[in-house]
């Protein structure tokens, strides 16, 4: 499928609108600090060039790779050295090293101002007067803050963003219509970004085999009626799509994702009975829908797994002859029978089974050695079951905010070297698992809980990688993808940690606290809580609870006072003194 001009090929496949949007996303994810107007200029130049190649594929430079074309364009930015420092050195390299260099400079936590939402009327006016610029600004702002956002999915979000404004800017009460929709889009966007970040981390840190294994588990759970060949085909294509997107090849990624959606819809009968509705939708919605489709019903006639994987006399022969295929089939067969297990658990079971075969197939009596292999799975299964039970009980007892606090204390004691903002952000996200998963029926709880926790812990891993401060975090993040969550769960209080010196400034609050939203107030309180634990790592939960209750009462009291600032100034030191006593 060789094309004389790759850029012309993608322009024709994707159409001008999607082409421009994807190039904008790609550039925004690479050059996260560049102003919007600069990016628009670059995108327009690339688009005009692409059009000349569509007209004549043999025209000058049209035969160049997309990386070469895009990299050359990025390297024309005048302020590259001043804005990005050593990222400018990438421009001295040749492809493919240059693109690898750009990828390594992607920043998961760029130093950008928080997005402030303008008044509804201001947004509606901007939308109605300059719709195209308004939507492109959305793509730009999201992409630069989330440099691994799944690009074709971001186009879907932009479509939903546009629909929200189209509907609500005509409504009687624009705010009541629009704001909940924007909140929902923001939350869904953050979730989508975090999920994709795990996929990219999986590919980049643990390789294609790890990603394929995870995909086999998920696809098999979703399409239990599909045969192994079909699952393998979908997994191979899916791996290509995500490898491309994670590698910055957004045009190829979007094109291949559309191809995969087409394939799935043309082969519904051999994949799943749940695809019909998705396949009736237009492209972006169709792909989104297929990615989130519910699990199909399990076939009724599935035979016992032990037949092929324990009882068969050919287990070692089959394993030896084609290790990856045999293990892929095991994972497929186990996963399609267990929609109630998390993908990570299924991968742990496959790893345990593989280790047992490595051990037993070497011996003179392999069958005698691996006969009880399925019994060895029990503790692996019970671990996430207990995790779900324990944490959902805590969530139901405390509610989300106090459950987040419980997790914040737990994780601050485990890894006190990690920065407080990171601990707060990660613990808040970990705590959301309760709201998201604990209301689910029993059969859906474990996959919801554990796979969500994997996504959140990956956020901790990527943030920590930027500035590593804890060997324990590094160890849990790098040793094994599937065992990250059990690794973090198993961490005890770090006894080697020297308590942080008391800093009065950390515990000094002002009247501006009263004007903060509920969420912002929670973050302030949780920041204080983490700092408190770092100062007194031996404090018990009861002691911390007392201090936090006193703190909440202090904020409430001062926010009701006539002279709020005076109240904070006067009562603050008293609170600090009382806390010191309570924690002594």
């Amino acid at each position: 499928d060789a094309h004389k001009s790759e850029v012309a090929h993608r322009f024709k496949d994707l159409g001008e609108e999607h082409f421009k949007d994807l190039v904008l996303v790609a550039f925004s994810q690479y050059l996260q600090q560049c102003p919007f107007e600069e990016h628009l200029k670059l995108v327009n130049e690339v688009t005009e060039f692409a059009k000349t190649c569509v007209a004549d594929e043999t025209a000058e430079n049209c035969d160049k790779s997309l990386h070469t074309l895009f990299g050359d364009k990025l390297c024309t930015v005048a302020t590259l050295r001043e804005t990005y420092g050593d990222m400018a050195d990438c421009c001295a390299k040749q492809e493919p090293e240059r693109n690898e260099c750009f990828l390594q400079h992607k920043d998961d936590k760029p130093d950008l101002p928080p997005l402030v939402r303008p008044e509804v009327d201001v947004m509606c006016t901007a939308f109605q007067e300059h719709e195209d610029t308004f939507l492109k600004k959305y793509l730009y702002e999201v992409a630069r803050r989330h440099p691994y956002f799944y690009a074709p999915e971001l186009l879907f979000f932009a479509q939903k963003y546009k629909a929200a404004f189209t509907e609500c800017c005509q409504a009687a009460d624009k705010g009541a219509c629009l704001l909940p929709k924007l909140d929902e889009l923001r939350d869904q966007g953050k979730a989508s970004s975090a999920k994709q970040r795990l996929k990219c981390a999986s590919l980049q840190k643990f390789g294609e085999r790890a990603f394929k294994a995870w995909s086999v588990a998920r696809v098999s759970q979703r399409f239990p009626k599909a045969d192994f060949t079909e699952v393998t085909k979908v997994v191979t294509d899916l791996t290509k799509v995500h490898t491309e997107c994670c590698h910055g090849d957004l045009l190829e990624c979007a094109d291949d994702r559309a191809e995969l959606a087409k394939y799935m819809c043309e082969n519904q009968d051999s994949l799943s009975s749940k695809l019909k509705e998705c396949c009736e939708k237009p492209l972006l919605e169709k792909s989104h829908c297929l990615a989130h489709v519910e699990n199909d019903e399990m076939p009724a006639d599935l035979h016992a797994l032990t037949d092929d994987y324990v009882e068969s006399k050919d287990v070692c022969k089959n394993y030896a002859e084609a290790k990856d295929v045999f293990m892929g089939m095991f994972l497929y067969e186990y996963s399609r029978r267990h929609p109630d297990y998390s993908a990570m658990l299924l991968l742990r079971l496959a790893k345990a089974y593989e280790a047992t075969l490595e051990k037993c197939c070497a011996t003179a009596d392999p069958h005698g050695c691996y006969a009880k292999v399925f019994d060895e799975f029990q503790p692996l299964v019970e671990d996430p079951q207990n995790l779900v039970k324990h944490n959902c009980e805590l969530f139901e007892q405390f509610g989300e905010y106090k459950f987040q606090n419980e997790l914040l204390v737990r994780y601050t004691k485990k890894v006190p070297q990690v920065s407080t903002p990171t601990l707060v952000e990660v613990s808040r996200n970990l705590g959301k698992v309760g709201t998201k998963c604990c209301k689910q029926p029993e059969a859906k709880r474990m996959p919801c809980v554990e796979d969500y926790l994997s996504v959140v812990l990956n956020q901790l891993c990527v943030l920590h990688e930027k500035t590593p401060v804890s060997d324990r975090v590094t160890k849990c993040c790098t040793e094994s993808l599937v065992n990250r969550r059990p690794c973090f769960s198993a961490l005890e209080v770090d006894e080697t940690y020297l308590p942080k010196a008391f800093n009065a400034e950390t515990f000094t609050f002002h009247a501006d606290m009263c004007t903060l939203s509920e969420k912002e107030q929670q973050v302030k309180k949780q920041t204080a809580l983490a700092e408190l634990v770092k100062h007194k790592p031996k404090a018990t939960n009861e002691q911390l609870k007392t201090v936090m209750e006193d703190f909440a009462a202090f904020v409430e009291k001062c926010c009701k006072a006539d002279d709020k600032e005076a109240c904070f100034a006067e009562e603050g030191p008293k609170l600090v003194a009382a806390s010191e006593t309570a924690l002594a």
């Epitope: 490595e358 051990k359 070497a362 009596d365 094994s480």
Partner: antibody, heavy 121, light 109 residues
Amino acid sequence: EVQLVESGGGLVQPGGSLRLSCAASGFSFSSSYWICWVRQAPGKGLEWVGCVFTGDGTTYYASWAKGRFTISRDNSKNTVYLQMNSLRAEDTATYFCARPVSVYYYGMDLWGQGTLVTVSS
Amino acid sequence: DVVMTQSPSSLSASVGDRVTITCQASQIISSRSAWYQQKPGQPPKLLIYQASKLASGVPSRFSGSGSGTDFTLTISSLQPEDFATYYCQCTYIDSNFGAFGGGTKLTVL
């Protein structure tokens, strides 16, 4: 580069003890491998001592080695050990550690250079 | 315990000769045998595994055959670098297995 390096050999008196180490690099024990010890007395043939499975620590020994020799592993250090007790003159040999061909044990494709143990008074 | 009896214990031959070494297991071991080459001062090098499969990087003049109890290593056309000692091994990891043959020293005639 994938390799095994033995250490800990030397001169020891009869009845004494010695612990040999086999450090792996280029691959991780956490992926589960068999690591075996083989010895060779000066001018003699190869003699299988035993093996450990890095996954769960399962061990097998040649019948003559049982009781006196113990094989263990420390996955965090990517190292396998051979603890030898009640040493005799006939234990004098070069001790090699080796890894079988992965995917079903077919023979040992990765060997260390060996470490010499001399048992003498 | 399985015993691997290798013969001959020594053998002299010339460059270009076809050489055969045999190994007999004291009990049936399926195709679980391997052959190694060892030169002085070096660790052994795997030549053949699973009775007949050529290990990675080994020249095709080496071949293995046999199953059950009788196994053979053949060098079709001896090269100068092939003069060394050869060992067979039962490749089960088990307390009663893992034994090597006594070795065959191949020298220049």
